[in-house]
């Protein structure tokens, strides 16, 4: 299944999930992090306001699960909710789920590799309990805690490497990119909106790229 | 394209040494960690040991743990898997394996056959 | 136990549906993950991180998990099917991971 495949609009789209918009479209008023999707976005001010909190009411998920997470480390989740809430390029990575919370998710998403790797290096050192952060948690207190028999310990034991966290985190919502910053050809988490969001034509290079071979297929198809 | 290349098939003697090497290219060594697994003629994948090609961390199954040694050249993107105190059930594939996270090995080298025969 | 157990052999009928499973208790806390293997070849991972199909896998291959098992189904199997499969999983004590022992199927007709 190549990413993508349950949907034709592949550009300038909104993931059907828990917070996001239906259309991408300007947001004056976004929050810290979140405010280099202002110009358009799939989040709204109150959304992006409300996932720079500790223990968000977006999700109940609490980041400091095995004590206090350093701030250098927390940034990255915060930037890594802000592309997921609000980023109206990720459209060709959407694939359908059957899950209670959401209709649709990103899969294999692919994260310029120095993104990926500062993140890692800026939370090696914090506390963990478990090395994928979708399924397994204690949710009896109403916010996810560490199941039993799952120890704290460091970032660095449940993600040894920047591949274990930024692909096993999230059930693979993203892959690491061979390709770097700047490429056009990898979603950066984090760029300066004042050169303009530089995921947009990283989102159409691999439209174009799904339409090319959506195209072959259905080639080869015709001729057997 | 992301390729995994293993050096040539071995014949070693019961009690020696052989070391395996695989050659990464295609993409960032450093990111990601390598595992070995091996394969003995018609039997189970079984898992070795694994290392972060980043800082050299390493985990050995316990079944070959003093027996193996998983090491890298991360300036010529090359891991390594040591055997020593060979014996006849060491005859096996072995396979180096790329994770992209616990256990989801998506390239694997072509193999390696050592064969441990008197 | 770090064990996961497959059933050593299955076959299924040209075009039919077949499902290999892998039982283990990592598989409460941890994904599976699944490969084809075919004589004298390397395995080729079909599904990861329980139900994620790799690129260029068809797309009759899916994973599912349920408790302490997953299951890969294949859809429709044809000729080209007929392999070896095995499941395999992180075990969270000691980051090591662990292979089941395999299922060879057979494609009937």
């Known amino acids: 299944a190549d990413p993508g495949q349950d949907r034709t609009d592949l550009l300038n789209v909104c993931m059907d999930a828990k917070h996001h918009k239906t259309k991408p479209g300007p947001e004056d008023k976004l929050h810290d992090q979140c405010s280099p999707w202002k110009k358009n976005a799939c989040c709204t001010a109150s959304t992006s306001q409300e996932l720079h909190k500790d223990t968000s009411r977006l999700y109940n998920f609490n980041w400091d699960h095995c004590g206090k997470m350093e701030p250098a480390c927390k940034r990255h989740f915060i930037q890594d909710t802000c592309l997921y809430e609000c980023s109206p390029n990720l459209g060709p990575w959407i694939q359908q789920v059957n899950q209670s919370w959401r209709k649709e998710r990103f899969l294999d998403v692919p994260l310029c590799k120095e993104d990926c790797q500062r993140w890692w290096e800026d939370c090696h050192t914090s506390h963990t309990c478990k090395s994928n952060w979708h399924r397994g948690w204690d949710w009896t207190s109403g916010v996810n805690k560490c199941p039993a028999g799952a120890l704290c310990r460091t970032f660095e034991s449940y993600f040894p490497t920047p591949a274990a966290l930024c692909e096993g985190l999230w059930s693979h919502s993203y892959k690491v990119s061979n390709y770097s910053r700047g490429s056009g050809r990898c979603i950066q988490m984090w760029f300066d909106s004042a050169q303009g969001n530089p995921n947009e034509e990283v989102a159409r290079f691999y439209a174009a790229a799904m339409h090319v071979n959506a195209g072959e297929m259905l080639h080869h198809h015709h001729h057997h | 394209e992301v390729q995994l290349v293993q050096s040539g098939a071995e014949v070693k003697k019961p009690g020696a040494s052989v070391k395996v090497s695989c050659k990464a290219s295609?993409?960032?060594?450093?990111?990601?960690?390598m595992h070995w697994v091996r394969q003995a003629p018609g039997q189970r994948l079984e898992w070795m040991g694994w290392?972060?090609?980043?800082?050299?961390?390493?985990k050995y199954s316990q079944k070959f743990q003093g027996r193996v040694t998983i090491t890298r050249d991360t300036s010529a993107s090359t891991a390594y898997m040591e055997l020593s105190s060979l014996r006849s059930e060491d005859t096996a594939v072995y396979y180096c394996a790329r994770d992209i996270s616990y256990g989801s090995f998506d390239y694997w080298g072509q193999g390696t056959l050592v064969t441990v025969s008197s | 136990s770090s064990e996961l157990t497959q059933d050593p052999a299955v076959s299924v009928a040209l075009g039919q549906t077949v499902r290999i499973t892998c039982q283990g208790d990592?598989?409460?806390?941890?994904?599976a993950n699944w490969y084809q293997q075919k004589p004298g070849q390397a395995p080729v991972l079909v599904i990861y991180g329980q139900f994620n199909l790799p690129s260029g896998i068809p797309d009759r291959f899916s994973g599912s998990s349920s408790g302490n098992t997953a299951s890969l189904t294949i859809t429709g199997a044809q000729a080209a099917d007929e392999a070896d499969y095995y499941c395999?999983?992180?075990?969270?004590?000691?980051?090591?991971?662990?292979f089941g022992g395999g299922t060879k199927l057979t494609v009937l007709g």
């Open positions: 395999d999983s992180r075990v969270s004590t000691g980051n090591h991971v662990v």
């Open positions: 295609g993409y960032t060594f450093t990111i990601y960690a």
């Open positions: 990592s598989l409460r806390s941890n994904y």
């Open positions: 290392i972060n090609a980043g800082n050299g961390n390493t």
